[in-house]
């Protein structure tokens, strides 16, 4: 329904607090280098303008689109050219090209300093001195580092962030109360950002059809009692929400997400029996809860799919009449019967079915041609099952850190051209699949593991896209969204790679390593491991293990020494020489 003033419409729907927060997120996600104060100023100007439009929708400029209003505002930033370079050229364009241009300049790996957590007392003082500014700064810092963070979900994180400070800054032991909560929010936030990044990549790189297929499969697993028409409606609405958020239309996205939550709760009887608790919560919690809700129980009696999708004489007729609807029904029926499969596996099965029908429905005897289509599914199902079994066994044998190291070596040998920080980050995250998923019973392992791996490999893909260095990575990332993981799994050692020149500086360590947290120390060691493999890609597991054991002993020894810096200098030289000898460098 058309509104005279879009900005007034969204301001009224969302309320001032959410409106301001979402505009701040939008601006910070576009102009990731701008100082906080500049963004606050821009947001206040937009908010004051929105209020004039609420008072009189016919007022000057109130009829302009949100993209026009926000783009014009962003283009008033004086330092645009010197801070952002060619992004300033976006301002010469008209809408909608200008917004597309801004979107293309979003940086998944912005050159921003690491967020350092101040002392708890310092944070609590800042929180009490100016709660509003403190929370805005949280939104700003997260949004600029995660330019695709799901905006309405970031509002939920901010609400939890505020609740943590409100509770813990009054506690007897502030740190004991606050720090675990902040750790949890940080870890959940990173996971939420990565999951949303995959949704946006799916929409932007593979199109709406790919996202809708993903959504049909996931919602059918989650709501197996819902009718196909109901699932289709939810998929359409969900696609609109994510298209808007991924496109920078955060006000519309948040508004539509609230409408979707309202619809789901009003119709929960025909959707899922698991929604009751979610639907009693306030809006932000409700939307989050619905997004995370457990799968409903399967209907008591579901027949074999063979009758409708293989044995029926009308298969080709039904397929020809409405291809995507028929394939959607196939995916819905398959997914609701298989909560034990990953979404990407279900999509591979649907793709195989589609390919078979494309071929067979043009054949002389279609039925004879597609009669054994489900036999083709067997290897597709068994491949991830076997892979997960093998890797969970390896994880249980090695523990998380050494399992990550095994993956570091594996992936560095596959794609040694990728930057070391990216290989470390991605392999560490791949390795977390063990503690995240291997504890689950078999029926939950595959959806946990393979769908998580899709999220992590997408991180590799978006980071690599910024600075492409490997044709193999590009190929696996762009050919097929659902086959990314099998594509990377199938990669062998890159025989074309010319080993990196040995540089002693890479393996020179200082006493500062002793004061690092365990996690940061692991990252240092894992960085060295990647560099070793880049120098000697053909090194055996045993050789690498020996060098890494020596390295661990060296760090431990020097961190206990009285003169740490001298120890690192002298013992470091010996370690480098011994490592070179061990690896035949």
């Amino acid at each position: 329904d058309a509104h005279k003033s879009e900005v007034a419409h969204r301001f009224k729907d969302l309320g001032e607090e959410n409106f301001k927060a979402l505009v701040l997120i939008a601006f910070a996600q576009y102009l990731q280098q701008c100082p906080f104060e500049d963004h606050v100023k821009l947001v206040n100007e937009v908010t004051e303008f929105a209020k004039t439009c609420v008072a009189d929708e016919s007022a000057e400029n109130c009829d302009k689109s949100l993209h026009t209003l926000f783009g014009d505002k962003l283009c008033t930033v004086a330092t645009l050219r010197e801070t952002y370079g060619e992004m300033a050229d976006c301002c010469a364009k008209q809408e909608p090209e200008r917004n597309e241009c801004f979107l293309q300049h979003k940086d998944d790996n912005p050159n921003l300093p690491r967020l350092v957590r101040p002392e708890v007392d310092v944070m609590c003082t800042a929180f009490h001195d100016n709660e509003e500014t403190f929370l805005k700064k949280y939104l700003y810092e997260i949004a600029r580092r995660h330019p695709y963070f799901y905006a309405p979900e970031l509002l939920f994180f901010a609400k939890r962030y505020k609740a943590a400070f409100t509770e813990c800054c009054q506690a007897a032991d502030k740190a004991a109360c606050l720090l675990p909560k902040l750790d949890e929010l940080r870890d959940e936030g990173k996971a939420s950002s990565a999951k949303q990044r995959l949704k946006c990549a799916s929409l932007q790189k593979f199109g709406e059809r790919a996202f809708k297929a993903w959504a049909v499969a996931r919602l059918s697993q989650r709501f197996p009692k819902a009718e196909f028409a109901e699932v289709s409606k939810l998929v359409t609405d969900l696609t609109k929400v994510h298209t808007e958020c991924c496109h920078g239309d955060l006000l519309e996205c948040a508004d539509d997400r609230a409408d979707l939550a309202k619809y789901i709760c009003e119709n929960q009887d025909s959707i899922s029996s698991k929604l009751k608790e979610c639907c009693e919560k306030p809006l932000l919690e409700k939307s989050h809860c619905i997004a995370e809700v457990e799968n409903d129980e399967m209907p008591a009696d579901l027949p074999s799919l063979a009758a409708d999708f293989v044995e029926s004489k009308d298969v080709c007729k039904n397929y020809a009449e409405a291809k995507d609807v028929f394939l959607g029904m196939f995916l819905y029926e398959y997914a609701r019967r298989h909560p034990d499969y990953s979404v990407v596996l279900l999509l591979r099965l649907a793709k195989t079915y589609e390919t078979t029908l494309e071929k067979c429905c043009a054949a002389a005897d279609p039925h004879e041609c597609y009669a054994k289509v489900f036999d083709e599914f067997k290897p597709l199902v068994e491949e991830p099952q076997n892979l997960i079994k093998q890797n969970c066994e390896l994880f249980e044998q090695l523990g998380e850190y050494k399992f990550q190291n095994a993956l570091l070596v594996r992936y560095t040998k596959k794609v040694p051209q990728v930057s070391t920080p990216t290989l470390v980050e991605v392999s560490r995250n791949l390795g977390k699949v063990g503690s995240k998923c291997c504890k689950h019973p078999e029926a939950k392992r595959m959806p946990c593991a393979e769908d998580y791996l899709s999220v992590v490999l997408n991180q590799l893909c978006v980071l690599h896209e910024k600075t492409p260095v490997s044709d193999r990575v590009t190929k696996c990332c762009t050919e097929s969204l659902v086959n990314r993981r099998p594509c990377f799994s199938a990669l062998e050692v890159d025989e074309t790679y010319v080993p990196k020149e040995f540089n002693a500086e890479t393996f020179t360590f200082h006493a500062d390593i002793c004061t690092l947290s365990e996690k940061e120390r692991q990252i240092k060691k894992q960085t060295a491991l990647v560099e070793l493999v880049k120098h000697k890609p053909k090194a055996t597991k045993e050789q690498l293990k020996a060098v890494m054991d020596d390295f661990a002993a060296f760090v431990e020894k020097c961190c206990k020494a009285d003169d740490k810096e001298t120890c690192f200098a002298e013992e470091g030289k010996k370690l480098v020489a011994a490592s070179q000898a061990a690896l035949g460098l």
């Epitope: 009696d301 063979a306 298989h338 909560p339 599914f377 067997k378 078999e442």
Partner: nanobody, 124 residues
């Protein structure tokens, strides 16, 4: 964990009947699609029949349609295969299987638990 034990196999003349039973222990079978498969000497295991969780739907291989009937009694935690008009080509080791999730009923990879099998020999 579900343990499955088949019984009721034996030697029977062509045209005769047998009733196979599959008793489950360790878990209730009402959450599982139950299926029967068979393997003749030197051949691959093949699907025979399957039945949905509450028994509302059944599914048969073309070769046994109209001669075999699958049924289940969830209160007794048992599935059955009534085999009539038996033929020499029905001679095989018959396996009972339970699958928590199944889209196709006929695909062995969708079944989680298997019995040891009971031998059926059809011979004059």
């Amino acid at each position: 964990e579900v343990q499955l034990v088949e019984s009721g196999g034996g030697v029977v003349q062509p045209g005769g009947s047998l009733r196979l039973s599959c008793a489950a222990s360790g878990s209730t079978i009402s959450s599982y699609v139950m299926g029967w498969f068979r393997q003749a000497p030197g051949k691959e295991r093949e699907f025979v029949a399957a039945i949905s969780r509450s028994g509302g739907y059944t599914y048969y291989a073309d070769s046994v349609k109209g001669r075999f009937t699958i049924s289940r009694d969830n209160s007794k935690n048992t599935a059955y295969l009534q085999m009539n008009s038996l033929r020499p080509e029905d001679t095989a080791l018959y396996y009972c299987a339970a699958g928590r999730y199944s889209a196709w009923y006929s695909q062995s990879y969708e079944y989680d638990y298997w019995g040891q099998g009971t031998l059926v020999t059809v011979s004059s």
